[in-house]
Amino acid sequence: QPDAINAAVTCCYNFTNRKISVQRLASYRRITSSKCPKEAVIFKTIVAKEICADPKQKWVQDSMDHLDKQTQTPKT
């Protein structure tokens, strides 16, 4: 789970070791701050939990792509 080091910066210190289906993911944000020990992706899940993931992992990249496409496609 992400940790807020102050009001403005949230960091990830550990990554999930289990892939989560994109069906269970709602959104994501990238963590690139130099104040954090590592680059990370924080997924917000359908049950509003935030989970830290490794942006180097293929499933993480695929999930971000999928969520990007979902955001770009207007819902009818």
Partner: antibody
Framework: QVQLVQSGAEVKKPGSSVKVSCKAS????????ISWVRQAPGQGLEWMGG????????NYAQKFQGRVTITADESTSTAYMELSSLRSEDTAVYYC????????????WGQGTLVTVSS | EIVLTQSPATLSLSPGERATLSCRAS???????LAWYQQKPGQAPRLLIY???DRAEGVPARFSGSGSGTDFTLTISSLEPEDFAVYYC??????????FGQGTKVEIK
């Protein structure tokens, strides 16, 4: 250690309803759900539906739609399954089982509740 | 609804033998969201394998799961007396629509 404790055996008349409870202890209720699974004598497992606590709503297998109601009381960490318009074919052991809504495998199970429908 | 078909219905083997149980899905099970359970008479099912190949806590190494897409396998490398039971597969890709296979009984030959 998570434990799910179910209510006791029930004998019901055809056409009546039954409400089975499932009390969870030793774990968080928040992003978890409870599924209800039944097993008729000598038969396999049949998923009836599930309730994810944070959503506050339930999903039901098509077969049971309109006849089953799954609810939960977060204050007491208890889930309920009510089945109405009972018939003899509903005689079965009813299990509750916990799952993490991020995944879905049923990692902890109740001991089961035998519901007998007989006139 | 994803239909899971298990085969064989019954497997008659001796202790020490290898058991191979199959579970075939009617549609692609994405993310390998498939589990295996063991059930003994009078007991609740017990989770053995999740995500097709990951062993649950406390499950002996002789149990292994494999497969993806529509074909999944549970293997018991060398049957112990306590392994004779019924085994079920379960898909959980859709939270609103879980399904189980009909079960495979592993009995003593």
């Amino acid at each position: 250690q998570v434990q799910l404790v179910q209510s006791g055996a029930e004998v019901k008349k055809p056409g009546s309803s039954v409400k089975v409870s499932c009390k969870a202890s030793g774990g968080t209720f928040s992003h978890y759900g409870i599924s209800w699974v039944r097993q008729a004598p000598g038969q396999g497992l049949e998923w009836m539906g599930g309730h994810i606590h944070i959503f506050g709503t339930a999903n039901y297998a098509q077969k049971f739609q309109g006849r089953v109601t799954i609810t939960a009381d977060e204050s007491t960490s208890t889930a309920y399954m009510e089945l109405s318009s009972l018939r003899s074919e509903d005689t079965a052991v009813y299990y509750c089982a916990r799952y993490d809504a991020h995944y879905g495998e049923l990692d902890f199970w109740g001991q089961g509740t035998l519901v007998t429908v007989s006139s | 609804e994803i239909v899971l078909t298990q085969s064989p219905a019954t497997l008659s083997l001796s202790p020490g033998e290898r058991a191979t149980l199959s579970c075939r899905a009617s549609q692609h099970v994405s993310d390998a969201y498939l589990a295996w359970y063991q059930q003994k008479p009078g007991q609740a099912p017990r989770l053995l394998i999740y995500d097709a190949s990951d062993r649950a806590e406390g499950v002996p190494a002789r149990f292994s799961g494999s497969g993806s897409g529509t074909d999944f396998t549970l293997t018991i490398s060398s049957l112990e007396p306590e392994d004779f039971a019924v085994y079920y597969c379960h898909q959980y890709i859709h939270l609103h629509s879980f399904t189980f296979g009909q079960g495979t009984k592993v009995e003593i030959k």
